[in-house]
Amino acid sequence: AGVFELQIHSFGPGPGPGAPRSPCSARLPCRLFFRVCLKPGLSEEAAESPCALGAALSARGPVYTEQPGAPAPDLPLPDGLLQVPFRDAWPGTFSFIIETWREELGDQIGGPAWSLLARVAGRRRLAAGGPWARDIQRAGAWELRFSYRARCEPPAVGTACTRLCRPRSAPSRCGPGLRPCAPLEDECEAPLVCRAGCSPEHGFCEQPGECRCLEGWTGPLCTVPVSTSSCLSPRGPSSATTGCLVPGPGPCDGNPCANGGSCSETPRSFECTCPRGFYGLRCEVSGVTCADGPCFNGGLCVGGADPDSAYICHCPPGFQGSNCEKRVDRCSLQPCRNGGLCLDLGHALRCRCRAGFAGPRCEHDLDDCAGRACANGGTCVEGGGAHRCSCALGFGGRDCRERADPCAARPCAHGGRCYAHFSGLVCACAPGYMGARCEFPVHPDGASALPAA
């Protein structure tokens, strides 16, 4: 039994152009957290059970708000180590996946929203009880720096934590720095010491005095990148130039990329472009699968044809993203019609409708002419979310149901008397006036003052 420990040193923009903007903004403060998934390094075991060695989630980091105009810094990290306890033997070779997640702390209804910022993966050899190993991994424009180690929990000892060791009550016959171990009282165990000068970052050992190299590194002390040793025979001493007489195998010869990955040479080594679902220097790490529970916010994980192939998440309404980690601004689609106000309640959308409209999306015009008749021969005229009836002569009111009193407005001028009639109104004019509304005076000579033609 023992514990795998991961210490994140920094997460921020990697070197070179195209540095990412900060994942947080003044409008939307956020904080980071990390997830690590460990698998035994042998591919057949990894295929069987994702995160079979265990997984851990960090605490949330401090809240960070971007300073406008400032370059994206390394982001504040959670305190403490990520610890993954293991019950059985430490396998020596293992695969890891480290995910960097962002938790947005805006005023989202229904709580914070998560999004995956970066995912790095690799396969490493590591003996339990050894020193911290440092690593740098890049994911897109982001760079993650971290250290890791595996340590045994007492009374387990050894490079695989499979042997049990107990302190002796009797004076020890072992030399300085050595411990007596069960089951043989006279067996002493020395701490594992690799060959002197063995690179702590790129080398490891399983036996004292040895120096074995991680993928991509070579040389007696694992200090030489693979690509710089690709000359089969150097030019002779008479040659002023350096280089290769016979070109050695290129870093992509024989395609070192597994699982259908494609290889491209880089100035110092090679790079694999991996198919979906695979990660690592050589695409040797099968990625997160449904068994790892990658779908957030109630998302359903739909696996590929085989258990270890890439997954997809079907997201509940209101969430999106490859892991259902992003809350959808469903109101941005402007689902409320006729000027209705959209409210995203998290569990549902609501539209607050303007006066005169109704329905889940304010699609029903309560005042429209559909199904609304104007009585007594009136005709309906729509406009601006309201309707009005243009009534036939002799009728009035909203629906032309009221018999109009044509004389109510006193239409007869100059003291003329108004009489309602079935077809409208009749004015009886006072002496000296004439016209339908008694609007024209009659001149003494008998001519009326009609307007000129």
């Epitope: 449904c290 068994a291 790892d292 529970g293 990658p294 779908c295 957030f296 916010n297 109630g298 998302g299 359903l300 994980c301 739909v302 696996g303 079907h314 509940p316 309404p317 209101g318 469903r330 569990h347 549902a348 959308l349 889940p360 999306r361």
Partner: antibody, heavy 118, light 108 residues
Framework: QVQLQESGPGLVKPSETLSLTCTVS????????WSWIRQPPGKGLEWIGY???????NYNPSLKSRVTISLDTSKNQFSLKLSSVTAADTAVYYC????????????WGQGTLVTVSS | EIVLTQSPGTLSLSPGERATLSCRAS???????LAWYQQKPGQAPRLLIY???SRATGIPDRFSGSGSGTDFTLTISRLEPEDFAVYYC?????????FGGGTKVEIK
């Protein structure tokens, strides 16, 4: 209040295609996933598949080669077609709405018994 | 697929007693994406619990859910006459969606 109502023939001949329709009332079919579940007489529940209003579908692998679920938003309906039926497909078929916080079933139709027999 | 095994198959209890129903998964159910349903004869199932422990709308507080990983429990604190029915668990973390075989709670 959302209500679901299954409709379709109660008797289907072996090797034919079972066709059922679910009519949704009291709410729009948009913005939700809609599912079919069945229950053979005296047995447990079996999920058949679901459809999202955007057209996403997912079917139970045990039935996938025979199942089609489709949606008619204009009628607020979704449908199930199960081809090449046998007596083992005799069951009460339920339509249901999938919840907003995950893929559980929050509203169910009352179910319709479909018997496969010649 | 994730296989859900419910136990016991039948539970014989009297009204007022406490009922404890178990649902065990063949592999871990991610994020406690587990639901419980009640089904009475001739009726459709009714959602009781989702997310392993959240009560659905209108469900009395005598129903409670707990558990994570592979072991989940539905507890009915005091059985009412209307609670005698068949109870199903369902996982919704990984496709295909699967149900348990059911536990029948009958009157003793």
């Amino acid at each position: 209040q959302v209500q679901l109502q299954e409709s379709g023939p109660g008797l289907v001949k072996p090797s034919e295609t079972l066709s059922l329709t679910c009519t949704v009332s009291g709410g729009s079919i948009n913005s939700y996933y809609w599912s079919w579940i069945r229950q053979p007489p005296g047995k447990g529940l079996e999920w058949i598949g679901y459809i999202f209003y955007s057209g996403i579908t997912n079917y139970n692998p045990s039935l996938k080669s025979r199942v089609t679920i489709s949606l008619d938003t204009s009628k607020n309906q979704f449908s199930l077609k199960l081809s090449s039926v046998t007596a083992a497909d005799t069951a009460v078929y339920y339509c249901a709405r999938i919840g907003v916080a995950g893929f559980y079933f929050d509203y169910w139709g009352q179910g319709t018994l479909v018997t496969v027999s010649s | 697929e994730i296989v859900l095994t419910q136990s016991p198959g039948t539970l014989s209890l009297s009204p007022g007693e406490r009922a404890t129903l178990s649902c065990r998964a063949s592999q871990s159910v991610s994020s406690s994406y587990l639901a419980w349903y009640q089904q009475k004869p001739g009726q459709a199932p009714r959602l009781l619990i989702y997310g392993a422990s959240s009560r659905a709308t209108g469900i009395p507080d005598r129903f409670s859910g707990s558990g994570s990983g592979t072991d989940f429990t539905l507890t009915i604190s005091r059985l009412e006459p209307e609670d005698f029915a068949v109870y199903y668990c369902q996982q919704y973390g990984t496709s295909p969606l699967t149900f348990g075989g059911g536990t029948k709670v009958e009157i003793k």
